[in-house]
C-alpha cells in the first residue's frame, strides 16, 4: 500500500469558445482555478483503480480533466474513451509531479461517458476513471415566487416551487423610486423564507437557482403617496394567491384602515392588520388583503380607505391564461451614421416576460422597465450602427410575441467590382439604395464620361444579409467593348462612389476613382 502514488484528480473549466472534440493536451487555456474531484482508490476492484467524483458539464462548455501524480521517475500513459485510444503526453510541473490532461472542447452528448487513463510508472501500474455527464437542465424549473401568511404569526412566507430547490431572498428598500434599484445602498437583502418586517416601502421576494432569478413584488398602495395618474392594475391567473398591502402613516394611532371590493367590505379572514410606531413616534399601519387562490369573481376594484387619508384603489384583473399585449407590426428606421437611437417595444404582459433581442444570429440581453401606466418597455441601443434586421422576442410560459425592426444607416455607397470573361459586376450597400450608371473610357472620353446605354442589368435588393439590402449592377460585355476600361458608379442622396474595371481581365483595375458629390 505504501508504494501507491498520491494521486490528485482535478477539473479545470475554460472560458474559451473553441470548437473541437476531446483531445489529450498539455497546453493551458484561459481557465478557472482547478477543482478537486476527490480521487480515491476504488474498493474491491481488480487492479489498482482510482475513481474521480462524477463530473457534470453544461452543453458546449469546455473542460480539462487533469491528473497530478506524485511518483518517482518517468511515467507513460494512455487515455481510452469508448474503446478508442487517445494520445497522452505527460509532463512535469514545478513540484515535479507528473501531469496528464484531457481537454474536452465544446461538450456534446457524444463526448459524455467514461474516460479511462492508464498510467505506468517505474513502481506500479494503475487506472484512473473519470465519468463525465451532461447536465440535464431540461428537468430544471424556476417558478416566480408567491406569498403565504405564516400560520399564527404576522409574517409572510415566500415560496418558489422550483428545481433545483432555489435560494429564496427578500429584497427590501425604504426609499422611493430609482434609489430602490437592485445594487443601491438603500436595498437590504435577507436570505430567508420568512419575513416579519412588513412595514418597508418596497418589498420583493426573489428565488434563484441554476436557471436564473425570478422576483415578485408585494403590491402596495401607500395612502401617503400621491396616487398615480392611471389606476394601478394587478393581473393574476386563476388559482394564484392575491396579496395587496395598504400602508398609511399618521401622527397618532387614531386612525383605521379598511379594504373594500367593489364597495363591499372584505370577508373576515381575508385581511390582517399590523401596526408599529416609527422613529419619529408616528404610527404606521398596514392592512393586507389576501385570497389564497383567486377565482374570476375576485376581479374588481379593491379600495383601501382610512379615517385620516384619502382612499385609493387598484384594479385586480383575474385572467385564465397569461398574455403579452403589444403591437407586432414591423418597424423600419432610417438613421444617420452617428445618430443616437434605440429600438423600443412597449407592452403589457402577465406573468412577467423573458425576452431577447437578436441581430445577425446573435442574442443580446434584454432589459425591461415598468412604466407608471401599467405598461413595460424594453429598449435596445447596442446596435453599433449596423444596418439590418433586429428581432425582439418575448415569452412568459403562456404567450409568445415577436416583433421585427429594420435599421437602415444613411450613408454614401461603397462599390465593390468584379469581372469575368463575359460580364462586369458592381455591388454596393449604401443607403438609400443607390442607382447605377456605367461609363466607357476611351480616346474620345478620357474622363470616362461616355454613357453605356445597353447591356446593363440592375438588381436592387437582391441579396439580404441579416436584413441589409445590397444593390448590384451587371454589364454584359460585347466583343466591341473588350479591352476597354469601364467605370461603374453608384449614387444616392449622400454621394457617389465609382470603380474602374478593365474588361476581359479577371479582376478590378488596381485603383478606385471615388468621386464625391
Amino acid at each position: 500500500n505504501q508504494d501507491l502514488p498520491v494521486i490528485k484528480c482535478v477539473l479545470i473549466n475554460h472560458k474559451n469558445n473553441d470548437s473541437s472534440v476531446g483531445k489529450s493536451s498539455s497546453y493551458p487555456m484561459v481557465s478557472e482555478s482547478p477543482e478537486d474531484l476527490g480521487c480515491a482508490l476504488r474498493p474491491q476492484s481488480a487492479g489498482t483503480v482510482y475513481e474521480a467524483a462524477t463530473v457534470e458539464v453544461d452543453v458546449s462548455a469546455s473542460i480539462t480533466l487533469q491528473v497530478l501524480v506524485d511518483t518517482p521517475g518517468n511515467i507513460s500513459c494512455l487515455w481510452v474513451f469508448k474503446h478508442s485510444s487517445l494520445n497522452c503526453q505527460p509532463h512535469f510541473d514545478v513540484q515535479n509531479r507528473g501531469v496528464v490532461s484531457m481537454v474536452i472542447l465544446k461538450m456534446t452528448e457524444t463526448q459524455a461517458g467514461e474516460y479511462l487513463l492508464f498510467i505506468q510508472s517505474e513502481a506500479t501500474n494503475y487506472t484512473i476513471l473519470f465519468t463525465v455527464s451532461i447536465r440535464n437542465t431540461l428537468l430544471f424549473t424556476l417558478r416566480r415566487p408567491y406569498f403565504r401568511k405564516m400560520e399564527n404569526q404576522d409574517a409572510l412566507v415566500c415560496i418558489s416551487e422550483s428545481v433545483p430547490e432555489p435560494i429564496v431572498e427578500w429584497v427590501l428598500c425604504d426609499s422611493q423610486g430609482e434609489s430602490c434599484k437592485e445594487e443601491s445602498p438603500a436595498v437590504v437583502k435577507k436570505e430567508e423564507k420568512v419575513l416579519h418586517e412588513l412595514f418597508g416601502t418596497d418589498i420583493r421576494c426573489c428565488a434563484r437557482n441554476e436557471l436564473g432569478r425570478e422576483c415578485t413584488r408585494l403590491f402596495t398602495i401607500d395612502l401617503n403617496q400621491t396616487p398615480q395618474t392611471t389606476l394601478p392594475q394587478l393581473f393574476l391567473k386563476v388559482g394564484e394567491p392575491l396579496w395587496i398591502r395598504c400602508k398609511a402613516v399618521h401622527v397618532n394611532h387614531g386612525f383605521g384602515l379598511t379594504w373594500e371590493l367593489e364597495n363591499k367590505a372584505l370577508e373576515e379572514g381575508s385581511y390582517f392588520e399590523m401596526s408599529t410606531y416609527s422613529t419619529n413616534r408616528t404610527m404606521i399601519r398596514i392592512l393586507f388583503a389576501f385570497v389564497s387562490s383567486v377565482a374570476r369573481n375576485d376581479t374588481g376594484y379593491y379600495t383601501c380607505s382610512s379615517s385620516k387619508h384619502p382612499s385609493q384603489s387598484a384594479l385586480v384583473t383575474i385572467v385564465e391564461k397569461g398574455f403579452i399585449n403589444a403591437t407586432n407590426s414591423s418597424e423600419d428606421y432610417e438613421i444617420d451614421q452617428y445618430e443616437e437611437f434605440c429600438f423600443s417595444v412597449r407592452f403589457k404582459a402577465y406573468p412577467q416576460i423573458r425576452c431577447t433581442w437578436t441581430f445577425s444570429r446573435k442574442s443580446f440581453p434584454c432589459e425591461q422597465k415598468g412604466l407608471d401606466d401599467g405598461y413595460s418597455v424594453s429598449k435596445f441601443c447596442n446596435h453599433k450602427h449596423q444596418p439590418g434586421e433586429y428581432i425582439f422576442h418575448a415569452e412568459n410560459g403562456d404567450a409568445q410575441f415577436t416583433k421585427m425592426f429594420t435599421l437602415n444607416i444613411r450613408r454614401k455607397p461603397q462599390v465593390l467590382a468584379e469581372a469575368s470573361a463575359s460580364q462586369a459586376s458592381c455591388s454596393s450597400d449604401g443607403y438609400p439604395l443607390p442607382s447605377w450608371t456605367w461609363k466607357k473610357c476611351s480616346d474620345k472620353s478620357p474622363n470616362c464620361t461616355e454613357d453605356i446605354p445597353e447591356g446593363v442589368w440592375n438588381r436592387k435588393a437582391n441579396r439580404k444579409v441579416f436584413g441589409q439590402w445590397v444593390s448590384s449592377s451587371t454589364l454584359n460585355m460585347s466583343e466591341a467593348m473588350k479591352g476597354f476600361l469601364v467605370k461603374c458608379c453608384a449614387y444616392n442622396s449622400l454621394g457617389t462612389s465609382c470603380e474602374t474595371i478593365l474588361l476581359n481581365s479577371p479582376g478590378p483595375f488596381p485603383f478606385i476613382q471615388d468621386s464625391i458629390s
Epitope: 478537486d36 476527490g38 480515491a40 476504488r42 474498493p43 474491491q44 474521480a52 462524477t54 458539464v57 433545483p164
Partner: antibody
Amino acid sequence: QVTLKESGPALVKPTETLTLTCTVSGFSFRNARMGVSWIRQPPGKALEWLAHIFSNDEKSYSTSLKSRLTISKDTSKSQVVLTLTNMDPVDTATYFCARMPEYSSGWSGAFDIWGQGTMVTVSS
Amino acid sequence: DIQMTQSPSSLSASVGDRVTITCRASQDIGYDLGWYQQKPGKAPKRLIYAASTLQSGVPSRFSGSGSGTEFTLIISSLQPEDFATYYCLQHNSFPWTFGQGTKVEIK
C-alpha cells in the same frame, strides 16, 4: 487546496435559531458531484451526524433532530447552510461540515475532507 | 436506526504495540464503514474507507478489515503521533451513525 470553513454565531440564546454556513473552496457543487454533511460534537463527547445534502439536492436528516433541522445549498456561493431551530443548552457543541464525493460506480468513501469546526454555545 | 458499538471505549498502549479496535453494527452494513482519527481540538481525519481501503497518504501501519456487522481497525506498530481518539462511521443507511469512540492513551 480543498477547504471547508464553518461560520456562524459563537453564542446563541435558548429558543433561538442557529444558522451555520459551510463555505467550500477548491471544488464546486456545480461541476463535481459532491455531497456535504453536518456533524457535531458536544464537549468531551462522541461525533453525531446531523444532516446531508447530495449533489442533486436530496436531503437526509438525523431521526432525533429532523423536526428542527434544515439543510440547503447555494451553488453560486459554494455554500451549504444548516439551520437548527429552538436551540437548547444541550445543543452546545463544535459543529463540523464534511465533504463526500459521489462516484458513478455507486460506492462511497463517506467524508474525505472536514472543516476545522465552529464552537457554538447555547446560553442565556 | 443502526447502532454502532465500538470497543474498547479507551485503551492504554506503548509505542510499538499492536492495537486492535472493533466496531459492531446492529445490522448488516456491507462495506459501508469508515475509520476516523481525531486529535484534541482538531477535525477528524479519514484513515480507512469502504471497511479496508487505506486513505491516500495514511501510513500502512493502519489497516481495516471486516464486512457485514463486524469491523476491525489495526495499528500494527503504535507511533507517538497515533495517540488520539478513533471513531467508526456507518454510511450504509440513514441516519448515518458513529461509534462512541475509542481513546488510545500512552501507557
